[in-house]
Interface confidence: low
Amino acid sequence: FERTRSLQDPCSNCPAGTFCDNNRNQICSPCPPNSFSSAGGQRTCDICRQCKGVFRTRKECSSTSNAECDCTPGFHCLGAGCSMCEQDCKQGQELTKKGCKDCCFGTFNDQKRGICRPWTNCSLDGKSVLVNGTKERDVVCGPSPADLSPGASSVTPPAPAREPGHSPQ
């Protein structure tokens, strides 16, 4: 009986952008301003996200999709759907509660976000330092003395991504 009733549910005919209005004999009513329904058959519309303060509107809300926010210049998104904005720092710095702080000697940060990471230790690979590290850049390892020959590569592999949620490949 329940299955039969659900198959005949008039709300299932309401498309995205509308809601099934119980106060009006379950007819499909359009979502009111500043609300949306992204799927059909919904009994209410969801309130649109408002991008205020440090948040900036990247995509306006429509009757079928929520607004999308990003961050004002000088800030970057954190979390799913840009749920937070965090202050940018300069390369060579990390963000602390007291603000941006220079990387300690022996560490670097080549991004405007995240923490300072230790320089590569070239000697672990039996290589020598070709270019010294800075607060903003990792060291560049060169060939070991035994490898010094024409065409020897002096470029290290790319540094690990430091973005949260970096997708595995």
Epitope: G114, I115, P160
Partner: antibody, heavy 119, light 111 residues
């Protein structure tokens, strides 16, 4: 699917060394830092150090400096943690843990390797 | 060697809420928004429950939430379930030479 597979349990005598391995699969090995964390029986978690599998750079907790060496083999996507001059208080489960984020947290963990130090 | 202080135990009945605290200093918890929480069942590896103070990885129920005030971070578990019984550890990035620290751990009992 991301997996970190650690080597089997070890029994060592005081003064010896142990080398634990952690083979990574299911993601690009050189794109994520790896940490080692240990846990003595009935005790809490203790951070030991971090290795950058791309360049091989390491950073160790002060407590372990001089006794621990972390290395990696990019051809097999494996990181290693060697602890020397073992003593009874080094008896613990040793975990490798992947670091995906800007703030240094641990999203995937190995199953752990029990190292027992006993005479 | 532990830097972050947690209560040794906490308890609650099914359906109730429980909050576990994690107290550090301005050099770790208070200085960065890089606090994470881990759940560990006996004989198992830890599992990430919260990162960056309040973010939940996919697959972690929304009953788990994190927050921070000053030098103290908190993990709140609402609608307690039997499977929530485990040890919980906080962790933080720190500006000290030891770059990552853990809490002392809290044993959660579901009554």
């Amino acid at each position: 699917e991301v997996q970190l597979l650690e080597s089997g349990a070890e029994v060592k005598k005081p003064g010896a060394s142990v080398k634990v391995s952690c083979k990574a699969s299911g993601y690009t090995f050189t794109s994520y830092y790896m940490h080692w964390v240990r846990q003595a029986p009935g005790q809490g978690l203790e951070w030991m150090g971090i290795i950058n599998p791309s360049g091989g750079s390491t950073s160790y907790a002060q407590k372990f400096q001089g006794r621990v060496t972390m290395t990696r083999d990019t051809s097999t996507s494996t990181v290693y943690m060697e602890l020397s001059s073992l003593r009874s208080e080094d008896t613990a489960v040793y975990y490798c843990a992947r670091d995906p984020g800007a703030g240094g947290y641990f999203d995937y963990w190995g199953q752990g390797t029990l190292v027992t130090v006993s005479s | 060697s532990y830097v972050l202080t947690q209560p040794p135990s906490a308890s609650g009945s099914p359906g109730q809420s429980v909050t576990i605290s994690c107290t550090g200093t301005s050099s770790d918890v208070g200085g960065y928004n890089y606090v994470s929480w881990y759940q560990q069942h006996p004989g198992k590896a830890p599992k990430l429950m919260i990162y960056d103070v309040s973010k939940r990885p996919s697959g972690v129920p929304d009953r788990f939430s994190g927050s921070k005030s000053g030098n103290t971070a908190s993990l709140t578990i609402s609608g307690l379930q039997a499977e929530d019984e485990a040890d919980y550890y906080c962790s933080s990035y720190t500006s000290s030479s030891t770059r990552y620290v853990f809490g002392t751990g809290t044993k959660l009992t579901v009554l």
